[in-house]
């Protein structure tokens, strides 16, 4: 699996999508977990609905929500009130009995500022990056246009 | 065993600009993020920043946001901060430390040995 | 930014005695979402880099002695040394853990009588 790399920053909401067969996913609820260590188990943060039919409802725990779109296919984490210690490595996970299929890799990554990012100083809008091996950026940031900036539309 | 091994103390003329290293061995470099921070003499500590070294993303604290860039090159597993307009206010030890959690930007688990930088002409 | 405060700024005591010393945060360092305390006790000893001794205000990094417990909540926090050694003189420091940009109490010198 690559890994996808979301962005946010500290104290805003940070939005996490993965897409999924609907088709061949049909049936199965949904999780979302933090990666621990390179070897170490991936700690269930929160799943979808007990039934699978409501699985559209958003379900919380603490700060993070979990909503799934069983029919187009995606499955949706909301982070809410981001922190510095939310940065991390997760995984979207499809369940099946005990066992559990990873739908995406997620590499968390929060921002003390909407402008810092890989290249100090540089104005960046968020996209996807081919700069590191197996990773791209998904667009994730928001941030407020400057006074006299001109509207750009977000890559993807 | 994890290590930070930092380079060496350096005497610097003020104005001038200085790039300081601190390389990593005993785990995977990438899996952990590094953090610099600045200890004056017999003072407190102050975060200067972060380095992701698997993509590269940075945060700073505001106070040291051009004062300070952190870079990584991950073939040699070694971190790299660049201070410049070096003044006697940034005479100080210079610490790089390891974050405690996996992918994550939390804790100083594991501290290098320090640069001390002094500025004098 | 959250600013870290530490008292006493210094303190000497003789080897077996016990130990106490305040940090305060100028903001919450606990996570409603989790519950957790983001806070961090650091041990620097003379002409060292600073040591991870305690995290999340209560739990000790592991090879950390058990004479040393981190405890409190919110606002304030406390690093007890249930019985000092000669070893544990230096300089401690607190850390919010919490939020950018992290900070330090500014320290607790140890001394030993």
């Known amino acids: 699996h690559n890994t996808t790399v979301f962005q946010g920053v500290a104290g805003q909401s940070l939005q996490v999508s993965c897409p999924y067969d609907s088709m061949k996913h049909w049936g199965r609820r949904k999780a979302w977990c933090r990666q621990l260590g390179e070897k170490g188990p991936c700690q269930r943060v929160v799943s979808t609905h007990n039934l699978w039919l409501l699985s559209f409802l958003r379900r919380w725990n603490g700060s993070t929500a979990i909503t799934d779109d069983t029919l187009g296919g995606t499955l949706t984490i909301t982070l809410r009130n981001l922190q510095p210690h939310d940065a991390g490595l997760y995984q979207c996970q499809s369940l099946h009995g005990s066992e559990a299929d990873t739908l995406r890799k997620v590499l968390v990554e929060v921002l003390a500022d909407p402008l810092d990012h890989r290249d100090a100083g540089d104005l960046w809008f968020p996209g996807e990056s081919e700069s590191f091996e197996d990773a791209h950026v998904e667009h994730s940031i928001s941030r407020s246009l400057l006074e006299g900036e001109i509207p750009f539309p977000p890559t993807s | 065993e994890v290590q930070l091994q930092q380079s060496g103390p350096v005497l610097v003329k003020p104005g001038a600009s200085l790039k300081m290293s601190c390389r990593a061995s005993?785990?995977?470099?990438?899996?952990?993020?590094v953090h610099w921070v600045k200890q004056s003499h017999g003072k407190s500590l102050e975060w200067i920043g972060l380095?992701?070294?698997?993509?590269?993303?940075?945060s700073y604290n505001q106070r040291f946001k051009g004062k300070a860039t952190l870079t990584v090159d991950k073939s040699s597993s070694t971190a790299y901060m660049e201070v410049n307009s070096l003044t006697s206010e940034d005479s100080a030890v210079y610490y790089c430390?390891?974050?405690?959690?996996?992918?994550?930007?939390?804790?100083?688990?594991?501290w290098g040995q320090g640069t001390l930088v002094t500025v004098s002409a | 930014d959250i600013v870290m405060t530490q008292s006493p700024s210094s303190l000497s005591v003789s080897a077996g005695e016990k130990v106490t010393m305040s940090c305060k945060s100028s903001?919450?360092?606990?996570?409603?979402?989790?519950?957790?305390?983001?806070l961090a006790w650091y041990q620097q000893k003379p002409g060292q880099p600073p040591k991870l001794l305690i995290y999340?205000?209560?739990t000790r990094e592991s090879g950390v002695p058990d004479r040393f417990t981190g405890s409190g909540s919110g606002t304030d926090f406390t690093l007890t040394i249930s019985s000092v050694q000669a070893e544990d003189l230096a300089v401690y420091y607190c850390?919010?853990?919490?939020?950018?940009?992290?900070?330090f109490g500014g320290g607790t010198k140890l001394e030993i009588k």
């Open positions: 380095i992701n070294p698997y993509t590269g993303t940075t």
């Open positions: 850390q919010n853990d919490h939020s950018y940009p992290y900070t």
């Open positions: 430390a390891r974050s405690r959690v996996y992918y994550g930007s939390s804790l100083f688990a594991f």
């Open positions: 005993g785990y995977t470099f990438t899996d952990y993020y």
């Open positions: 999340g205000a209560s």
């Open positions: 903001q919450s360092l606990l996570n409603s979402g989790n519950q957790k305390n983001y």
